[in-house]
Interface confidence: medium
C-alpha cells in the first residue's frame, strides 16, 4: 500500500508515534517519505547483504529475520515480511524499539539527512488529526 501523507500521519498517531521518545509526528512522516516514499512494500538491498523492509525501511541485520542475512539479530522478533503489510502495526512496534535503542531517530539515515533540523511540522500541516 502507498499511503497518502495525511493518511499515514493519522495511522502513525493512532499507533502512538506522536512524541514517542520525544519525536513529533512530523519527524515520523518525514522519515517515511524519504525512506520508502510512503510505500509499505518497499524493499532495498544493502551492500552488506542485508535488506531494508517496509515504510520505515527496517534493516534485516538487526531488527527482523528474512532468513538470509548472516548474523541477523532479529531484535524485534518478527519476520521481515511482516513489515511489508498494509497494516503498519508491526513496523511501528519495531520502530519504537529502534528509536529507544540509544541513537534515537539517527538510526534512520534518511531522517538524519533529510528531516533532522528541518521544519518537520510541514509534513502534517493541513492534516485533520
Amino acid at each position: 500500500k502507498v499511503f497518502g501523507r495525511c493518511e499515514l500521519a493519522a495511522a502513525m498517531k493512532r499507533h502512538g508515534l506522536d512524541n514517542y521518545r520525544g519525536y513529533s509526528l512530523g519527524n515520523w512522516v518525514c522519515a517515511a517519505k524519504f525512506e520508502s516514499n510512503f510505500n509499505t512494500q518497499a524493499t532495498n538491498r544493502n551492500t552488506d547483504g542485508s535488506t531494508d523492509y517496509g515504510i520505515l525501511q527496517i534493516n534485516s541485520r538487526w531488527w527482523c529475520n528474512d532468513g538470509r542475512t548472516p548474523g541477523s539479530r532479529n531484535l524485534c522478533n518478527i519476520p521481515c515480511s511482516a513489515l511489508l503489510s498494509s497494516d503498519i502495526t508491526a513496523s511501528v512496534n519495531c520502530a519504537k524499539k529502534i528509536v529507544s535503542d540509544g541513537n534515537g531517530m539517527n538510526a534512520w539515515v534518511a531522517w538524519r539527512n533529510r528531516c533532522k533540523g528541518t521544519d518537520v511540522q510541514a509534513w502534517i500541516r493541513g492534516c485533520r488529526l
Epitope: 512494500q41 538491498r45 547483504g49 528474512d66 532468513g67 538470509r68 548472516p70 515480511s81
Partner: antibody, heavy 115, light 107 residues
Framework: QVQLQESGAEVMKPGASVKISCKAT????????IEWVKQRPGHGLEWIGE????????YYNEKFKGKATFTADTSSNTAYMQLSSLTSEDSAVYYC?????????WGQGTTLTVS | DIELTQSPATLSVTPGDSVSLSCRAS??????LHWYQQKSHESPRLLIK???QLMSGIPSRFSGSGSGTDFTLSINSVETEDFGMYFC?????????FGGGTKLEIK
Amino acid sequence: QVQLQESGAEVMKPGASVKISCKATGYTFTTYWIEWVKQRPGHGLEWIGEILPGSGSTYYNEKFKGKATFTADTSSNTAYMQLSSLTSEDSAVYYCARGDGNYYYWGQGTTLTVS
Amino acid sequence: DIELTQSPATLSVTPGDSVSLSCRASQSISNNLHWYQQKSHESPRLLIKYTSQLMSGIPSRFSGSGSGTDFTLSINSVETEDFGMYFCQQSNSWPRTFGGGTKLEIK
C-alpha cells in the same frame, strides 16, 4: 517438511514465452524469498533473480532483465517465472530455491527445450 | 559482479583418497560462501554454509575452511557416493554468483 515442486518439462518454439511454476509447501510462503537459478551444460549455475511472495518485491540479475518476469500467488503458495522471446540460449534446467542466503531447499528443476 | 573461480576443473581420485577443492573470489566475501554437491540429473544439495558450517545429515568427512577470497572444501577419505559436481556460491552481494564447478571423478 519444506518442499518445492516445479512444473514439468517444456518444449517451446523460438520467439514463444513459457511460464514455469514452483509450488511451496511446509513453510510460510510469504516470509521467504524464492530464487530462480538457470543451469546449462558447460555454463554452470546462474542466479536469475528473486521474489518475496508476501509483497511481490522482485530483484533481477541485470543479465536476465527483460527475459524473466517473476510473480507469486499467495493463495496457492506458488511462484512463477515467465521467460519471453525464447531462443536456443534459453534451453536449460531452471530451478526454484528458497532464498536463505544459501539454498538448502530446491525444486526438482524444470527442463526447457527451445527448438 | 563477484566472480568465483573453482579449481581444479576436474579431479580424478581413488576411493579412500583425501582431496581439497578450491574456490577463489574476485573480491572479499567474508565468510559468505556455500558449497553444493550435484549428481547427474539431480538438484544441487547444500553441504556446507557460511564457509564451515556442516549441514545436518552431511557426513563429517566433509569440511570447509577459508575467509575473504580463498576457500577450500575438503573431503577426508572419499567414498564412491561422493563423486559428482561441486559448486561454490557467494551470498555476500547481489547478484548471487556460483563457481564454474569441480568435477570429482573416479580414477
